[in-house]
Every structure is written in structure tokens, then in C-alpha cells.
């Protein structure tokens, strides 16, 4: 036990970060939201399009209340890390035709890396389960052809809409339990 | 401003007992994992164990698994650490630390002799 | 011995630009977990200086700054200053042990 420390250093408290957190993630849902109209627009969508690859809706709003912190944020976590590793995927083997979604879709992959640092200290000053950040996982197949690719783009946007949208309901729910 | 004041350490026999607490103020508590770290004197840090916000997730660093306890009463603001089977090695200032760890207190320290 | 290894002793002149490093495996670092860096002044309790690989609290100077890559971090002191001769630590999770592992710490001398 030594002398009295020197002047406070502070970080965000879990709730002040829980805030930001939701800031970002809207932030990010409308960057999304944006982003695949600008996509309708130049490659109007015939139909749904899914992708195999992709997590499944982690669940309805609805079921929200029954939702606990740790399973929430680690489902987010796992979901988001996906779809970050899914627009990684789009901008490198989409073909020439998504090259006109850039810079846009650059700007998405660096939010959703922010937003995937911030979950991740705001699980590590909750002190909850933190499963790594970074799996490993199976490369993903490049698309069969420049429609393919479109069609990809389609379904990962509209996936990580609705992703996002379930986030931030869950993470406005969650700041009442904290 | 931030406060963490650990409490409870002491000289203690080979195989006897003591229970750390750690008294928190200036913040959130409640919102905040706690960890407990200790330091050997004259060596680097050693993390010894940490509870989740509500108390509802322990993980223990093997060297104290079986031997020591982590709790919290949140409605107290406190954080504890009840430390049995005590030994020479586990001679050391302990710290209370909360979140990252963010804030650490000064420390208490902890001496197993005989 | 620390799962986090890091140089035991570094030094350097005041004004002068130190690095330290600090290296970590496949369950830590490598994993993609944050690092975050402690300076323990003598006779004193760690104190946070930089989380998540290169965020400041507010409070430190931004002569420290953090950065990682793969399975290494390090930590940068610029415009070195006698009251930085300290202790600093590097942290990290550690998926296998569920826990936060430390460096063993590196002592850092202003000549």
C-alpha cells in the first residue's frame, strides 16, 4: 500500500458506454439502411435474397423482454462479427459492378469494426463471458458470377438491417437492467 | 472521485484464513465486473479472480481455484474475497480493481507465515 | 512466468521516444483481444494509461499512445519526462484461463 494516487484517470462508465454504443449502432443502421437503397437503386432486387453464410434473425422484438445481458450481447457480437466478415468478403471478391457502393461500403466495415470494439470492452467492464473476438472460420466462397455477387450484397445488407435493428432495441432494453 | 478501499489483510499461519473486502465509491458500482489482483513483493502482477456486474459470472486464476471466493453485495457497495488455505506463495498486496480494470484501489497487503 | 512477455527493462533519455512491447499467443492477443496498458508508479497502485490497444483515458497525455497487431502490442512514450520512470504492465484476455494475464512488467529508466 503506497502513497495517495495522482490525479483521476477516467473511462466511460458501462452505462455512459452502453449509450455511445447505441449511438453508434444507429449510426450504423441508418449508414446500412442508406447504403441498400442506394443498392435497390442501381440493381433493383427480384424478390428475397438469403445467403447460407449468414446468422439467422437472432430473434423477434417481441421476445426482447425475456432477454438476458450476456446472451444479448454475445449473440450481437457473434452476429455482427459475421456480417463484418461478410462485407470484408463483398468488397474484395464482389465483382466490378459493388465497386460503385465505395467508399460507402468501406465506411460500413470500419463502423462495424468500432461497434464490435465497443461491444467488446463494455463486455470486458461487465466482466461477462467473452468468447474470442476474432473465431476462426471457414473462408467464404467467392461469388459465381457479377449477379451473384449483387444478389450477395442484397442479402447481406438487408440481413444486417435487420440485425441492427434488433440491436439497438435490445440495447435500449438492457440499459434499464444496468 | 473514485475510491476503492480494500481492507482485511493481515499476518496469517500456512493453511488459516482471511476474507478481503473492498469498500467502492464515486461510481457505479452496481455496473462495474470486479477483479481482484495481487503482487508478489518485488514482482509484477498476478490476477487472482473477477465477478461479473450482478455477481452472476466467477472466474478464478488456477493458482487460487478451490481456495479462495469471490462475491459482492451490491447493495452495500462492496467486494470480497475469502481466502482459505492460505500459503507462503500467496503472500502479496492485493487489489481490489473494477471494469477493465479501470480503477484500482491502493491495496492491502497479505502475509502467510509461520 | 507470465503468459505476456514483455522486455524486462527499457530507458531512455528525457525528450526522447521509448517503445515497449509486448507479446502474446493465439488464446490472448492473437485471439483478438483488447490490450490495455498499466503504469505502476514506484511505491504506488497500477493505474490504467491506455485500453482497447490505443484508447486514452481522459487524464493521460497524449504523449502515450498503444498500438497492436496479430499476436504483439506495444506502448509508445514520446517526449520522455523523469516522472515516466515507472513499472508498465500490459494486459489481456486469455480465453483459457477466463481471466485477464498480465506482462511481467517492464521498468522503464530516464536517464
Known amino acids: 500500500p503506497g502513497p495517495p494516487p495522482g490525479p483521476p484517470r477516467v473511462s466511460p462508465d458501462p452505462r455512459a458506454e452502453l449509450d455511445s454504443t447505441v449511438l453508434l449502432t444507429r449510426s450504423l443502421l441508418a449508414d446500412t439502411r442508406q447504403l441498400a437503397a442506394q443498392l435497390r437503386d442501381k440493381f433493383p432486387a427480384d424478390g428475397d435474397h438469403n445467403l447460407d453464410s449468414l446468422p439467422t434473425l437472432a430473434m423477434s422484438a417481441g421476445a426482447l423482454g425475456a432477454l438476458q445481458l450476456p446472451g444479448v450481447l454475445t449473440r450481437l457480437r457473434a452476429d455482427l462479427l459475421s456480417y463484418l466478415r461478410h462485407v470484408q468478403w463483398l468488397r474484395r471478391a464482389g465483382g466490378s459492378s459493388l465497386k460503385t457502393l465505395e467508399p460507402e461500403l468501406g465506411t460500413l466495415q470500419a463502423r462495424l469494426d468500432r461497434l464490435l470494439r465497443r461491444l467488446q470492452l463494455l463486455m470486458s467492464r461487465l466482466a461477462l463471458p467473452q468468447p474470442p473476438p476474432d473465431p476462426p472460420a471457414p473462408p467464404l466462397a467467392p461469388p459465381s458470377s457479377a449477379w451473384g455477387g449483387i444478389r450477395a450484397a442484397h442479402a447481406i445488407l438487408g440481413g444486417l438491417h435487420l440485425t441492427l435493428d434488433w440491436a439497438v432495441r435490445g440495447l435500449l432494453l438492457l440499459k434499464t437492467r444496468l | 472521485e473514485v475510491q476503492l478501499l480494500e481492507s482485511g489483510g493481515g499476518l496469517v499461519q500456512p493453511g488459516g484464513s482471511l476474507r478481503l473486502s473492498c469498500a467502492a465509491s464515486?461510481?457505479?458500482?452496481?455496473?462495474?465486473?470486479m477483479h481482484w489482483v495481487r503482487q508478489a513483493p518485488g514482482k509484477g502482477l498476478e490476477w487472482v479472480s473477477v465477478i461479473s456486474y450482478d455477481g452472476s459470472y466467477k472466474y478464478y486464476a488456477d493458482s487460487v481455484k478451490g481456495r479462495f471466493t469471490i462475491s459482492r453485495d451490491n447493495s452495500k457497495n462492496t467486494l470480497y474475497l475469502q481466502m482459505n488455505s492460505l500459503r507462503a506463495e500467496d503472500t502479496a498486496v492485493y487489489y481490489c480493481?473494477?471494469?477493465?480494470?479501470?480503477?484500482w484501489g491502493q491495496g492491502t497487503l497479505v502475509t502467510v507465515s509461520s | 512466468q507470465s503468459v505476456l512477455t514483455q522486455p524486462p527493462s527499457a530507458s531512455g533519455t528525457p525528450g526522447q521516444r521509448v517503445t515497449i512491447s509486448c507479446t502474446g499467443s493465439?488464446?490472448?492477443?492473437?485471439?483478438?483481444?483488447?490490450v490495455h496498458w498499466y503504469q505502476q508508479l514506484p511505491g504506488t497502485a497500477p493505474k490504467l494509461l491506455i485500453y482497447?490497444?490505443?484508447e486514452r483515458p481522459s487524464g493521460v497525455p497524449d504523449r502515450f499512445s498503444g498500438s497492436k497487431s496479430g499476436t504483439s502490442a506495444s506502448l509508445a512514450i514520446s517526449g520522455l519526462r523523469s516522472e515516466d520512470e515507472a513499472d508498465y504492465y500490459c494486459a489481456a484476455w486469455d480465453i483459457s484461463l477466463n481471466g485477464p494475464v498480465f506482462g511481467g512488467g517492464t521498468k522503464l529508466t530516464v536517464l
Open positions: 480493481a473494477a471494469g477493465v480494470p479501470d480503477y
Open positions: 482497447s490497444n490505443n
Open positions: 493465439s488464446s490472448n492477443i492473437g485471439a483478438g483481444y483488447d
Open positions: 464515486g461510481f457505479t458500482f452496481s455496473s462495474y465486473g
